[in-house]
């Protein structure tokens, strides 16, 4: 038995910053899990790990170097990430992996969310133009 | 009830390798990450690496060079190995349970390194 | 790597009293900090995570704060079983790293 997994198609980070919300064909609510974000076609890169035990404070953390943060639904769990660059516009997978009660369970690997990540704005605003030329 | 079990060669000499095992009873094997942590006799903690059910691993940089780590899931075990050893390497090595925090640990191990 | 650093080394209290035990972050590591109690021959024992979380069968006395890069465990009331080693451990960053402990002795 594999748990399903549904992402968002693409999302854009535009202030270098997105949510992506991993939704789960399973309820998490009193199980202890681990739920991970994934970069790249391989999954090699492991973004965030959120890691849940019954009812104690979730933990969340990222080994990779990523800004992370993550919130927990009964049957999803979402991924903040801050600081993003522009060169980690990539592919996306939501993994997530139940220990107890048993069976293990892991989820069928999922479409992945494309992130795309726009560069902060750095032209000068209207309102403040830059010096005028001669 | 999680119980870790170690076991391996206490007395080595300089430029030998290391070599521990943990068996892990009850509870799931898969999910969590295994680690392995050391402590210098008098001294404070040192995680060294760790270890998931499919062979995912993360090591200190500053002990990468020397340490594989690897894991059996048909007998719920994982494994150190620790090459060439020198006297700082003597310590009790502990195995754990737990990536970010180790929630269950093995009764530890002392290994002594001399000539 | 992130550098954690306790204080005082040696803390001297008498059963019933306050201890108060801070550990220091070289850089943010938000609220990933954890505790452990080590007493000699056995091994450490998870008391707090996420700076202030107690981790399942810790006694109410032991309280953990802090954010950041300063961090404290507080433990209320001193029982005879709680004289011991006390170390903070950061999981913000890879490597895992430990301080070098608060040992906690009889006044």
């Known amino acids: 038995n594999k748990i399903l997994v549904k992402q968002s198609p693409m999302l854009v980070a535009y202030d270098n910053a997105v949510n992506l919300s991993c939704k789960y064909s399973y309820n998490l609510f009193s199980r202890e899990f681990r739920a991970s974000l994934h970069k790249g076609l391989d999954s090699a890169v492991e973004v965030c790990v959120v890691y849940g035990n019954y009812s104690q404070q979730l933990q969340v953390y990222s080994k990779t170097g990523f800004n992370c943060d993550g919130k927990l639904g009964n049957e999803s769990v979402t991924f903040y990430l801050q600081n993003l660059y522009v060169n980690q516009t990539d592919i996306y997978f939501c993994k997530i992996e139940v220990m107890y009660p048993p069976p293990y369970l892991d989820n069928e690997k999922s479409n992945g969310t494309i992130i795309h990540v726009k560069g902060k704005h750095l032209c000068p605003s209207p309102l403040f133009p830059g010096p005028s030329k001669p | 009830q999680v119980q870790l079990q170690q076991w391996g060669a206490g007395l080595l000499k300089p430029s030998e390798t290391l070599s521990l095992t943990c068996a892990v009873y009850?509870?799931?094997?898969?999910?969590?990450?295994w680690n392995w942590i050391r402590q210098p006799p008098g001294k404070g903690l040192q995680w060294i690496g760790e270890?998931?059910?499919?062979?995912?691993?993360n090591y200190n940089p500053s002990l990468k060079s020397r340490v594989t780590i690897s894991v059996d899931t048909s007998k719920n075990q994982f494994s150190l190995k620790l090459s060439s050893l020198t006297a700082a390497d003597t310590a009790v090595y502990y195995c754990?349970?737990?990536?970010?925090?180790?929630?269950?640990w093995g009764q530890g191990t002392l290994v002594t390194v001399s000539s | 790597e992130i550098v954690m650093t306790q204080s005082p080394a040696t803390l001297s209290v008498s059963p019933g009293e306050r201890a108060t035990l801070s550990c220091r972050a070289s850089?943010?590591?938000?609220?990933?900090l954890a505790w452990y109690q080590q007493k000699p021959g056995q091994a450490p024992r998870l008391l707090i995570y996420?700076?202030?979380a107690r981790a399942t069968g810790i006694p109410a006395r032991f309280s953990g704060s802090g954010s950041g890069t300063e961090f404290t465990l507080t433990i209320s009331s001193l029982q005879s079983e709680d004289f011991a080693v006390y170390y903070c451990?950061?999981?913000?960053?890879?490597?895992?790293?430990f301080g070098g402990g608060t040992k906690v002795e009889i006044k």
């Open positions: 996420g700076a202030s």
């Open positions: 850089q943010s590591v938000n609220s990933n």
């Open positions: 451990q950061q999981y913000y960053n890879w490597p895992l790293t």
């Open positions: 754990a349970r737990g990536e970010a925090v180790a929630l269950y």
């Open positions: 009850g509870g799931s094997f898969s999910g969590y990450y």
């Open positions: 270890i998931n059910h499919s062979g995912t691993t």
